[in-house]
Structure formats: C-alpha cells, structure tokens
Interface confidence: medium
C-alpha cells in the first residue's frame, strides 16, 4: 500500500485495554534456509477474541513490513526488493544472505488486549544441507 512516508525506523504498539491478555502467539520457531533461497515467516495469534488492528514484522529494531486492517500491506522501502507480503499475515523473505541471520518478530497489535509479540530465529546457511523447519500453516 502506498504510504506517504519515506521509510520506517521501527516501532510498534497498539490499542490495548484493561482486560487480561489471554492470547498466545505460535511461530515457526527456529528455522534455517539456504543462502540465495527464500523462507516464509509465519505467526498465528490464538486464544483471544481481540481484534487484530495491525501486524508489524521487525528484524531487531528495523521495521520490515506492516499489515494494517484498513490499509493493507506496506513494505519498508529499504526491504521492498527482497520482502513479499503473505501468505496470510506472514512474510516471505527472498534472495537470502548470511546477513539475514538473526531474530525476527511478529507484533500483533490488538484491541483491547494490546501488543502480542512472537519471535522467530532464522539461520541462513552457506551449504545446501540447510534443513527448513516444517512449514507453518495458519488454520
């Protein structure tokens, strides 16, 4: 979606309320992939009836992408050549390099619960023996 800002510096945070945060985030956990290949990052929020207003995908403190309930997807300009939205609320990383190794976070901004965060660790391997973690399916 064509947001009218030049880039993102990170950040998140969303609606929340006085209610208990009962939800849980399921993620793909620790995954590995080959250099030059692609990988799907998936999270799933369960055990809450909270409304998801926005999902942010972050790598350390860099914002990769946003999926907003009203506006749809926005990919940060510095990642737009290598990041594709989906499937679902997930994120596809392409043309992987060893520098892509590290922590990735899905942040579900919900009302009235607040922000839920899931963590994925991606290791990008040089060799072809990289074992991909089991594909995570959103029901």
């Amino acid at each position: 979606y064509p947001y009218d800002v030049p880039d993102y510096a990170g950040g998140g945070g969303s609606g929340g309320g006085g209610s208990m945060m009962t939800g849980t985030i399921e993620t793909t956990g620790n995954i590995s992939a080959e250099k030059g290949g692609s990988i799907i990052l998936q999270c799933h929020l369960s055990s809450t009836t909270a409304q998801v207003t926005q999902v942010n995908w972050e790598q350390q403190d860099q914002l990769l992408a946003i999926c907003n309930a009203d506006l749809g997807w926005h990919i940060s300009p510095s990642f737009k050549d290598r990041v594709a939205p989906g499937p679902g609320l997930g994120l596809t990383l392409q043309s992987l390099t060893v520098n892509d190794t590290g922590e990735y976070f899905c942040i579900y901004h919900t009302y009235p619960d607040g922000a839920y965060t899931g963590r994925i660790f991606l290791e990008v391997l040089e060799s072809s023996v990289a074992e991909h973690g089991a594909r995570f399916q959103i029901p």
Epitope: G12, G13, S14, G15, G16, L71, H74, H109, Y111, G114
Partner: antibody, heavy 119, light 107 residues
Framework: EVQLVESGGGLVQPGGSLRLSCAAS????????MHWVRQAPGKGLEWVAF????????YYADTVKGRFTISRDNAKNSLYLQMNSLRAEDTAVYYC????????????WGQGTMVTVSS | DIQMTQSPSSLSASVGDRVTITCRAS??????LAWYQQKPGKAPKLLIY???TLQSGVPSRFSGSGSGTDFTLTISSLQPEDFATYYC?????????FGGGTKVEIK
C-alpha cells in the same frame, strides 16, 4: 507541510453539545489514524479518542464513552468530535493529532481549540 | 489502565547542563513509550517514540532509553529553547496514557 487546524470550541452550558472539527492538509489524510487529546487548564495531557484511517477501529477514553463520538470524512480531509452531555470537567483545550503510521504515538498536533463548560 | 509516573515534576537547570527525566509505567509496556515537549500556549511536539527512536527533525541532544517499566529522557546539553514541559506516553495499550509532566525551568 503537515497542518492540523481545530475549530468549533467555545462556551457551552453543562448538558450542552459542541462539535469540534479538525481540518488536515499537507499529507494523505486517508492513510492516517487520528486522535483527539485534551488538556484541562494548568493540567497534563489526556487522551480522548482515536479513529483509524478507514474508520474500522474507534476507541474512547472511559471518561467520555457514550457522550463523545469521533468521526472522519476522508473526502473532506476532516476529523470531528461530537461532544454531548458536556460537564464542567470537560473544560479543556482539545487537540487533534495524527498517529504515526507504525504505531499509536502522535507525530503532528493542531494548535488546539478551547472548550469551556460553565453555567 | 496503565499509570505513568514521571519524576521529577519540575527541575531547574542551566544552559549546557545534562538533564535526565524518568518515567515509570505501572506494568511492562515493552519499548512502547513516547516523549513529547510542550511550551506554554503551544501544542505538544513528538521527540522520541518506541522508547529510543528520535523523531525526524529533533536535535540529537535528545535521547531516550529504557524498556519494560523504566524509561529515561536525556537532554545532553540543555539549550535555551529546551525550557518546556516534557510528557511521556505509553503506546502499548488502550487507553493510551500520559505521565503528569516534568517542567524544566531556568536556574
């Protein structure tokens, strides 16, 4: 240049109504969530209401819930706050503020409009 | 609701001083804290968001740190235009709440 200009404030009796407006320019209004925040004379800031870019998410502070209604007209680049059943404690400067695209902090604010509720 | 407590409520300092303002949340808000500056008769201005990220156009003498419940705004070398009231705001949960403010006055 981002500009937010509030209007519609004034003196009103307890139990009365007012409609505040916020005219936005210098950015794509329809892409941004918007807030109303108020500040009673000599006091701190109090968040009042929020509306998302497409009006699918609307939230209110408990102190105004059921009395105030936030709305927007993206075609007119305008934000509104309909205030009913006004009380003396609603006396404040009311600011409209733009929400950053990536989270719920307010990156641009209007100059404010004063609402005085008094008999 | 999350209560935000700022300290001190006011302080006196001189131009060139290093000034530190703290903000404590009544429960964890991760990194989701913003800092605003407000001058008399004016609207607030966003300085810092997401705990430590400097808003575009804000001088680098302003910095933010902290996560969880304890946060700090630091002005490394106070300038004449920095005398104002500073507010913290949590943006982790509805309803979004502000601290009571810290007034920075000229010594």
């Amino acid at each position: 240049e981002v500009q937010l200009v509030e209007s519609g404030g004034g003196l009103v009796q307890p139990g009365g109504s007012l409609r505040l407006s916020c005219a936005a320019s210098g950015f794509t209004f329809s892409n941004f969530g918007m807030h109303w925040v108020r500040q009673a004379p000599g006091k701190g800031l109090e968040w009042v209401a929020f509306i998302s870019s497409g009006s699918s998410s609307i939230y209110y502070a408990d102190t105004v819930k059921g009395r105030f209604t936030i709305s927007r007209d993206n075609a007119k680049n305008s934000l509104y706050l309909q205030m009913n059943s006004l009380r003396a404690e609603d006396t404040a400067v009311y600011y409209c503020a733009r929400m950053r695209l990536d989270y719920y902090a307010m990156d641009y604010w209007g100059q404010g409009t004063m609402v005085t509720v008094s008999s | 609701d999350i209560q935000m407590t700022q300290s001190p409520s006011s302080l006196s300092a001189s131009v060139g001083d290093r000034v530190t303002i703290t903000c404590r949340a009544s429960k964890s808000i991760s990194k989701y804290l913003a800092w605003y500056q407000q001058k008399p008769g004016k609207a607030p201005k966003l300085l810092i968001y997401s705990g430590s990220t400097l808003q575009s156009g804000v001088p680098s003498r302003f910095s933010g740190s902290g996560s969880g419940t304890d946060f700090t705004l630091t002005i490394s070398s106070l300038q004449p235009e920095d005398f104002a009231t500073y507010y913290c705001q949590q943006h982790n949960e509805y309803p979004w709440t502000f601290g009571g403010g810290t007034k920075v006055e000229i010594k």
